[in-house]
Amino acid sequence: MRRGPRSLRGRDAPAPTPCVPAECFDLLVRHCVACGALRTPRPKPAGASSPAPRTALQPQE
């Protein structure tokens, strides 16, 4: 259930994020952690619906 580093902010996150490219912001502890520590739905095979629409590069929310 893990994606690789999210190196770019998308239009989804207008405010700057405090994390370096290999990290993601953990909303609960309020600091950056390795992206692999946080659950995000894995990509489904082509043609299958994913739990939430996500692009290859995601905002560090």
């Epitope: 996150a13 993601c24 909303l27 609960l28 502890v29 995000t40 995601q58 929310e61």
Partner: antibody, heavy 118, light 113 residues
Framework: DVQLQESGPSLVKPSQTLSLTCSVT????????WNWIRKFPGNKLEYMGY???????YYNPSLKSRISITRDTSKNQFYLQLLSVTTEDTATYYC????????????WGAGTLVTVSS | DIVMTQTPLSLPVSLGDQASISCRSS???????????LHWYLQKPGQSPKLLIY???NRFSGVPDRFSGSGSGTDFTLKISRVEAEDLGVYFC??????????FGSGTKLEIK
């Protein structure tokens, strides 16, 4: 697909300890936040607490010092203990996984009704 | 803790009607990162809650387009344009901006008139 299943006794006597297990398949509990939420008769949902990828915990202050959430990573299970229960702890108990990008509960167990009664 | 106030508690509707549920938070749900973590769940009878809408207005995978979410700050609305029988159940709003703890609205029971 990730699946969660709660298990434990459906009837607990007042003053005793409520103990539930959440078994997770399809994902590792060493990633993300794993949560307990309960629903009282009358539809009120209460967030109870979590255990995180690192093993750290958070407990809702409303539960004071009665609650403990632990895990066994070798079994991919996490646990709820609620001490000194009263009839007001009668509820349906859910375990749930938290999406780490949009921060919603993306996967829930079916829930288990626990009745506190003598 | 953030208090989520949902109205109405009960919403009797006729099939095909529009339904509207309001959710108000005790503080703004705009996070310092600019995102608003306000979500809507539906709990059908005998089932666990399922996500409908995330971050105010984004439909979760598989959710019909008759469901829409809107709002900002402290005031949010879930609309169902044409209610179908499968939509019956209890709707909850929830916030993930000021956490922990996560908090939920009191629930709105959508039922047939």
């Amino acid at each position: 697909d990730v699946q969660l299943q709660e298990s434990g006794p459906s009837l607990v006597k007042p003053s005793q300890t409520l103990s539930l297990t959440c078994s997770v398949t399809g994902d590792s509990i060493t990633s993300g936040y794993w949560n307990w939420i309960r629903k009282f008769p009358g539809n009120k949902l209460e967030y109870m607490g979590y255990i995180s990828y690192s093993g750290s915990t958070y407990y809702n202050p409303s539960l004071k010092s009665r609650i403990s959430i632990t895990r066994d990573t070798s079994k991919n299970q996490f646990y709820l203990q609620l001490l000194s229960v009263t009839t007001e702890d009668t509820a349906t108990y859910y375990c749930a996984g938290l999406d780490g990008l949009y921060w919603y509960f993306d996967v829930w167990g079916a829930g288990t009704l626990v009745t506190v009664s003598s | 803790d953030i208090v989520m106030t949902q109205t109405p508690l009960s919403l009797p509707v006729s099939l095909g009607d529009q339904a509207s549920i309001s959710c108000r938070s005790s503080q703004s749900l705009v996070h310092s990162n600019g995102n608003t973590y306000l979500h809507w769940y539906l709990q059908k009878p005998g089932q666990s809650p399922k996500l409908l809408i995330y971050k105010v207005s984004n439909r979760f995978s598989g959710v019909p387009d008759r469901f829409s979410g809107s709002g900002s700050g402290t005031d949010f609305t879930l609309k169902i344009s044409r209610v179908e029988a499968e939509d019956l159940g209890v709707y909850f709003c929830s916030q993930s901006t000021h956490v922990p703890p996560f908090t939920f609205g009191s629930g709105t029971k959508l039922e047939i008139k």
